[in-house]
Amino acid sequence: MQLSQVSDLLTQEQANLTHQKKKLEGQISARQQAEEASQESENELKEMIETLARKLNEKSKEQMELHHQNLNLQETLKRVANCSAPCPQDWIWHGENCYLFSSGSFNWEKSQEKCLSLDAKLLKINSTADLDFIQQAISYSSFPFWMGLSRRNPSYPWLWEDGSPLMPHLFRVRGAVSQTYPSGTCAYIQRGAVYAENCILAAFSICQKKANLRAQ
């Protein structure tokens, strides 16, 4: 065997070894990448598990709180079951009173009678809070509503049904304030303002009575 042949064989062998080395390096690199990827996904899985565990813990706490609230509500319902409602059906409860907005249009005297038949009186405004509530309640409507305020003639004071006088700081009565009518002058509320008019006119009205706020 000649030296040149030996040299060629060595060169060929070296090329094979280089190729195998590169192949092995590629495999090692791929395995390392796979291992790294596996580690990453393992880490991701760990994070997901931790997150899920945390959320599950939170939900368990929420469920526990809701359970306690449910128990409390059941207790409250048991107590309420032994009490009557503060207002009859169709009446609106606000503060210490119940209010009913009439569905029929009548003169002031008839409106008063309708309220009396329901064990109530026509609306009486005692405070700015009462006025605010009524203004809010009738804001959807453009209709006039009789209230329990009237006077015999302009030389007399405005009086509520119970005989108490109108507190001047609450509101100013507008409209037919200087008028005298055989049927008297009565007050109605419309769009938040209070007007005086002939009690003989037919209008809607607001009845009012004390709310039942005591346990039986």
């Epitope: 003169n107 006039p144 005298t180 009518y181 005086a196 008019e197 002939n198 003989i200 006119l201 209008a203």
Partner: antibody, heavy 119, light 110 residues
């Protein structure tokens, strides 16, 4: 001083429409009820309609119900009468009048505007 | 469709007293006040009497109003030539929910 000034009258064909206005001055407009009253030539006074301070109470004479619409704009101190489906018998001088109460007396009147319904 | 009834005409000599009647029902004059208006030829009506018997400022005291039951009347004393005019009574009818006028009375000063 109190002033009521009607406008919008004129000649209109039967079935036609017209809108009358009454401009007010010299008083607090929203504190008064307002009426339309008409007077046919050589005839007496005929009440047409009334509107309360904020329009909560509105009433019409049977002869115009469903055809005429009264309204007011308190921000403009103006009263209106929208007249539709006009008939020959609606021919009259139309007055606007002020009342301190819806059912009380008319203490001030405008000079009137003539509406003639004819073909 | 006149609800309040007035005589179509009345007359009197200067200085005399005349009355104009106005008849209604329980749903108008019987339960509400009566007003009276004077309308001089070619002019708008003018308030003469309100709330049955009250005279607005500027109206002479020769004019007076009264009411009894379902009827009202306007009295003019010391009749003057310038009183020649049409006079209308007016009330509110609560049953029909409308203003009602009388047909008017023509006063002639002889």
């Amino acid at each position: 001083q109190v002033q009521l000034l009607e406008s919008g009258g004129g000649l209109v064909q039967p079935g036609g429409s017209l809108r009358l206005s009454c401009a007010a001055s010299g008083f607090t407009f929203s504190d008064y009820a307002l009426h339309w009253v008409r007077q046919a030539p050589g005839k007496g006074l005929e009440w047409v309609s009334v509107i309360s301070y904020q329009g909560g109470f509105i009433y019409y004479a049977d002869s115009v119900k469903g055809r005429f619409t009264i309204s007011r704009d308190n921000s403009k101190n103006t009263l209106y009468l929208q007249m539709n489906s006009l008939r020959a018998e609606d021919t009259a001088v139309y007055y606007c009048a002020r009342s301190p109460g819806l059912t009380s007396y008319h203490d001030s009147w405008g000079q009137g505007t003539l509406v003639t319904v004819s073909s | 469709d006149i609800v309040l009834t007035q005589p179509p005409s009345v007359s009197g000599a200067p200085g005399q007293r005349v009355t104009i009647s106005c008849s209604g029902s329980s749903s108008n004059i019987g339960s509400n006040y009566v007003s009276w208006y004077q309308q001089l030829p070619g002019t708008a009506p003018k308030l003469l009497i309100h709330s049955n018997s009250h005279r607005p400022s500027g109206v002479p005291d020769r004019f007076s109003g009264s009411k009894s039951g379902t009827s009202a009347s306007l009295a003019i004393t010391g009749l003057q030539a310038e009183d020649e005019a049409d006079y209308y009574c007016q009330s509110w009818d609560y049953e029909s929910e409308r203003v009602v006028f009388g047909g008017g009375t023509k006063l002639t000063v002889l």
